[in-house]
Amino acid sequence: PSGLVTANITDSEALARWQPAIATVDSYVISYTGEKVPEITRTVSGNTVEYALTDLEPATEYTLRIFAEKGPQKSSTITAKFTTDLDSPRDLTATEVQSETALLTWRPPRASVTGYLLVYESVDGTVKEVIVGPDTTSYSLADLSPSTHYTAKIQALNGPLRSNMIQTIFTTIGLLYPFPKDCSQAMLNGDTTSGLYTIYLNGDKAEALEVFCDMTSDGGGWIVFLRRKNGRENFYQNWKAYAAGFGDRREEFWLGLDNLNKITAQGQYELRVDLRDHGETAFAVYDKFSVGDAKTRYKLKVEGYSGTAGDSMAYHNGRSFSTFDKDTDSAITNCALSYKGAFWYRNCHRVNLMGRYGDNNHSQGVNWFHWKGHEHSIQFAEMKLRPSNFRNLEGRRKRA
């Protein structure tokens, strides 16, 4: 025979074809062998011009030989070489599918690989590719979009060889709150790391606000609206600054009275105050907290104390906010001016968390009277809020 070729090569099959001998022959003897593969020999009819090779090993170079027989006579042998395809990984599956994450798992191919190419694509055409190592059989997808159909494909790699792709289709779960109105809704969406988040006042996507969410204290879900920690930010600011907010949300900052009013107008909120000083900690929680609008000069409502810091905020309940340039307190003197801060002063304060950092002069520093008195400026303070019914929402989410 002559013109031996192979066609239709896959990872486990190939088709051998040849030109028949000019003379009539009784049969053809076909043999094939690969590295670490024992030789297989088959005899086929003399009028056959092709033979399907099966049960081949993937990614293996085979040597194929064929000669003709007529009676006791044998023709010369012709040879061809071919390499089987790399076989595909198997059983690609998406598990642990959440709103923004999913876990892809697969079984490796029989052939050894140098890696895998993962491709995942959303219905909107966003495609991402990632190459993972040869010993990997799972990969966590992150930053997915909620309520979105995805097609995930995987291909094994071995040097220049690439297997066929296999695929799976999955859909991320929808966010409970597509436009979270506070950190509790962000948390119920599955975000459990403290840091910067965008919330949407009243769930309106046009009313976006960047906030720092405390996702760890007492179950998390808190919007932090004040932080004192190092004295780098100046808190002796005017009315306009306190209305709008100032500072770095990751560091020392004040979120702003307008924002506090809008947030607390969304429903019933609770207040938490966390204090730290030289290794000591204390907290206060008030189960009713709200801040009025600018017409009320951001009047404070704070009720229902529990905690370890002592009930120092009760004294300020019902008071309007005061700054050095807008004196709304009940003192003859200007409390903000006297104590170099701003607060819902009365005459003047039991709480002065916006006072002068590190100033231990009487009533001038960062004070919480019922914890450290007025002659000790507290090193770390945070004020934060979340819905009063957060525990109920959390339970409902867990059951869901």
């Epitope: 003859i332 005459n347 003047c348």
Partner: antibody, heavy 120, light 107 residues
Framework: QVQLVESGGGLVQPGRSLRLSCAAS????????MHWVRQAPGKGLEWVSG????????YYADSVKGRFTISRDNAKNSLYLQMNSLRAEDTALYYC?????????????WGQGTMVTVSS | DIQMTQSPSSLSASVGDRVTITCRAS??????LNWYQQKPGKAPKLLIY???NLETGVPSRFSGSGSGTDFTLTISSLQPEDFATYYC?????????FGQGTKVDIK
């Protein structure tokens, strides 16, 4: 209208006990801290004890600490002062008073008082 | 404990007089100072809270001032019903303490 009415005073021997009560009306009782203030005959005012709106925090003057116990029943709008181991110097007119806003604050409403006389 | 010292302990005045009573705290108390009026056989009545705030229903002839440690109660024009004993009280910290009282009687 807002009102506080004390009761339970009387003549008692030294070492004995007495329980004073104060009935409140006209305001949301559990929103406010309440106090007992006493006035010995012909003398000035002396703060005795206080209790937060929830009843979770209590406060005492050193002169009565360990002998007197303040409590409240918000369901009954009532304040109490349990006085044990009474002494002659506890003889006074005992007033119940409402705190203006926070636990330590001005006393904006006062009862008419109940007289406690400790004598053998 | 914070000591509250009132002066004078008593004074005689006539109707129409301007009367001033002072109260000194033994330590700094911001504006946590209240004034009461007590008439014989009656319970005390709150006049001024937070050093300078007039309690509802109290006549405007009464005023309070001061901050820190030194405080003043002023009756701008003494009326017959104002003859009574006046007490200052600090509500800065527990135990809340009263001054010894100032008796205002008719000259």
């Amino acid at each position: 209208q807002v009102q506080l009415v004390e009761s339970g005073g009387g003549l008692v021997q030294p070492g004995r006990s007495l329980r004073l009560s104060c009935a409140a009306s006209g305001f949301t009782f559990d929103d406010y801290a309440m106090h007992w203030v006493r006035q010995a005959p012909g003398k000035g005012l002396e703060w005795v004890s206080g209790i937060s709106g929830s009843g979770g925090s209590t406060y005492y003057a050193d002169s009565v600490k360990g002998r007197f116990t303040i409590s409240r029943d918000n369901a009954k709008n009532s304040l109490y002062l349990q006085m044990n181991s009474l002494r002659a110097e506890d003889t006074a007119l005992y007033y119940c008073a409402k705190s203006y806003q926070s636990d330590e604050d001005a006393f904006d409403i006062w009862g008419q008082g109940t007289m406690v006389t400790v004598s053998s | 404990d914070i000591q509250m010292t009132q002066s004078p302990s008593s004074l005689s005045a006539s109707v129409g007089d301007r009367v001033t009573i002072t109260c000194r705290a033994s330590q700094y108390i911001q504006g946590f100072l209240n004034w009461y009026q007590q008439k014989p056989g009656k319970a005390p009545k709150l006049l001024i809270y937070d050093a300078s705030n007039l309690e509802t229903g109290v006549p405007s002839r009464f005023s309070g001032s001061g901050s820190g440690t030194d405080f003043t109660l002023t009756i701008s024009s003494l009326q017959p019903e104002d003859f009574a004993t006046y007490y200052c009280q600090q509500s800065y910290s527990t135990p809340q303490t009263f001054g010894q009282g100032t008796k205002v009687d008719i000259k």
